[in-house]
Interface confidence: medium
């Protein structure tokens, strides 16, 4: 999906109002120094592409994030403020079911959510720069 035509201001407002709180709740009890941020993004559409990927695509060591509250709110926000987003996601979900390879090892969900927080902060920063 091409996030170029999203209403970035509205997405930022939704993030600051609810999604950020849910992400922080998920991370509560962990220190910001526990994990290094290795994922970055360069502009608003790129940030949203990375956010979508980390939130909804099961990774080898974290498969459950898509059912968390912050993910549900992220999905609703993108569907609301990115034209045509909902339709593209239905096909993507079907295609993904067979494709992924998971690995039974160490749980990395907290690390992944830490990366997500970093991506969202980057999204807000790039938005402020544009303004």
């Amino acid at each position: 999906y091409d996030f170029t035509n999203c209403d970035f201001q509205k997405i930022e407002a939704d993030y600051l109002r609810t999604i950020s709180k849910d992400l922080i709740t998920y991370m509560s009890g962990t220190k910001s120094t526990d994990f290094n941020n290795t994922v970055s993004c360069s502009n608003r559409p790129h940030c949203l592409t990375e956010i979508q990927s980390l939130t909804f695509n099961p990774t080898p060591r974290c498969a459950s994030l898509a059912k968390e509250m912050f993910a549900r709110k992220t999905k609703a926000t993108l569907a609301l403020w990115c034209p045509g987003y909902s339709e593209t996601q239905i096909n993507a979900t079907q295609a993904m079911k067979k494709r992924r390879k998971r690995k039974v090892t160490t749980n990395k969900c907290l690390e992944q959510v830490s990366q997500l927080l970093g991506l969202w902060r980057r999204f807000i920063r790039t938005l402020l720069k544009q303004q």
């Epitope: 009890g29 498969a63 969900c109 907290l110």
Partner: antibody
Framework: QVQLVQSGAEVKKPGSSVKVSCKAS????????IHWVRQAPGQGLEWMGI????????SLNQKFQGRVTITADESTSTAYMELSSLRSEDTAVYYC??????????WGQGTLVTVSS | DIQMTQSPSSLSASVGDRVTITCRAS??????LAWYQQKPGKAPKLLIY???TLPEGVPSRFSGSGSGTDFTLTISSLQPEDFATYYC?????????FGQGTKVEIK
Amino acid sequence: QVQLVQSGAEVKKPGSSVKVSCKASGYSFISYWIHWVRQAPGQGLEWMGIIDPSDSDTSLNQKFQGRVTITADESTSTAYMELSSLRSEDTAVYYCARSLDGYYDYWGQGTLVTVSS
Amino acid sequence: DIQMTQSPSSLSASVGDRVTITCRASENIYSYLAWYQQKPGKAPKLLIYNARTLPEGVPSRFSGSGSGTDFTLTISSLQPEDFATYYCQHHYTTPWTFGQGTKVEIK
């Protein structure tokens, strides 16, 4: 709704094998791992092993390595756990459970396996 | 393997009491801790995961806290249906292991 339905109780002789089935319904079988956990009478819970039904990748508790085989049949949405060389201390309730990241949101009803001569 | 140690192993309480059960991991498991409730003859039921997240349908009187190695399950006001055995379990890395259980009995 999500259901994991296990096969019935078994009585086995020492040295023999038992195969317990776990039929899943109400969700996409290949999207979740199936774990096997056992509980001896009056005791706690013990993780035995796991299977990814999408490709039959397994990981087993070292304690059961060589004695336990976990398989899955995607066409029938059924997972199986076979335990061989049974001894009296294997008498337990065997549970299958569904998981994405190591915690179990749905469990089978349990299968009592009694090992007795 | 990561060892999980629960305390107490049993406790007696009355309806309406606040009950606290603790679980200690032998090494850092961050917030990867789940709590289960089990009644006699039944399969365990998930109460909490990620140390503090309640799945849908679990009453809000149950709460979890802690991270690293020390965790707590709290029942704010014990109800008749809460008399059961409670287990903690880490979901950090294989092999996943459980605490030995805490039996909550009627005083």
